[in-house]
Amino acid sequence: DIIMRPSCAPGWFYHKSNCYGYFRKLRNWSDAELECQSYGNGAHLASILSLKEASTIAEYISGYQRSQPIWIGLHDPQKRQQWQWIDGAMYLYRSWSGKSMGGNKHCAEMSSNNNFLTWSSNECNKRQHFLCKYRP
């Protein structure tokens, strides 16, 4: 049998059954999530669930830039350090940079400090690049 690899929308990249779109526009976290959702197919800000997935994403983004942090789909909606993925994925894999999680920082970004392999918390109203993900 021939198994066809699903196709992603133009410009989105495919990895392990998912499509990813890297948006080089400035949005706060909630606006970024709304923009991801607008693409349908169950798209959300990206969940990153393994080191392999993190490495693939980091390598892709580093081909564009190495300085700007990028919103992902991890947030702390209750503001109690109870982090969860907006797409409902289980919060098992963690890659925090180790910086302080205090203050009014309840949304997660991929940090450029470690080539996008680690995450930092930031204020959700900051306008940043963002990464969307969906399963085709």
Epitope: G21, F23, R24, K25, Y64, S67, Q68
Partner: antibody, heavy 124, light 109 residues
């Protein structure tokens, strides 16, 4: 009021050189990236080169790389384009434009102000 | 990649016209798109930035949008006026470079 005034255009033979200048006023010149955009007679717009506000980063279109050099003097609020090894296909009106701001592969801000342009004609 | 625009468009005064700008590869949605108006004999003027934002002084008859399905950006001008006649260029970013569309000549009949 933002003003950009280009000068230095003219007729030059193929293989020759020319230096364009752009005098800027009405904004804090050193805070903004600047660009050169050209338009061949009857044709569309073509981005040529850009430089960061500090002058530390420069960018070029493939068509001019190695022949053109962009620079700026923030003490004089002036942008320059040194054009060497000129070819007939470089004939165009050259516009000085404010913006966009690019760093490490990421660009923001549009070309929000343009000069009137200066005509460069490369012909024997 | 390239940005492709129709060579020319004509419409009557008072009508609405939509100019398109199609990206050949990569997603039109990933980077901001700008639109510039160039009246005959004049320098370009910014009319839309960041996909759909209007600079101060540009009338609200001008609006921009992005359609990811067709991978294109659009500039819509309503209540067309004779002074809208000219060339319109879309522009986006490619790494540290700037890419312009070939331009659309808008004629107000």
């Amino acid at each position: 009021e933002v003003q950009l005034l280009e000068s230095g255009g003219g007729l030059v033979q193929p293989g020759g050189s020319l230096r364009l200048s752009c005098a800027a006023s009405g904004f804090t010149f050193s805070s903004y990236a600047m660009s050169w955009v050209r338009q061949a007679p009857g044709k569309g717009l073509e981005w040529v080169s850009a430089i960061s506000g500090s002058g530390g980063s420069t960018y070029y279109a493939d068509s001019v790389k190695g022949r053109f050099t962009i620079s700026r003097d923030n003490s004089k609020n002036t942008l320059y384009l040194q054009m060497n090894s000129l070819r007939a296909e470089d004939t165009a009106v050259y516009y000085c434009a404010k913006g966009p701001d690019c760093t490490n592969g990421v660009c923001y801000l549009p070309f929000d102000y343009w000069g009137r342009g200066t005509l460069v004609t490369v012909s024997s | 990649f390239m940005l492709t625009q129709p060579h020319s468009v004509s419409e009557s005064p008072g009508k609405t016209v939509t100019l398109s700008c199609t990206r050949s590869s990569g997603s039109i949605s990933f980077d901001y798109v700008q639109w510039y108006q160039q009246r005959p004999g004049s320098s370009p003027i910014l009319v839309i930035f960041e996909d759909d934002q209007r600079p101060s002084g540009v009338p609200d008859r001008f609006s921009g949008s992005i359609d990811s399905t067709s991978n294109s950006a659009s500039l819509t001008i309503s209540g067309l006026q004779s002074e809208d006649e000219g060339d319109y260029y879309c522009q986006t970013y490619d790494d540290n470079r700037q890419v312009f569309g070939g331009g659309t000549k808008l004629t107000v009949l």
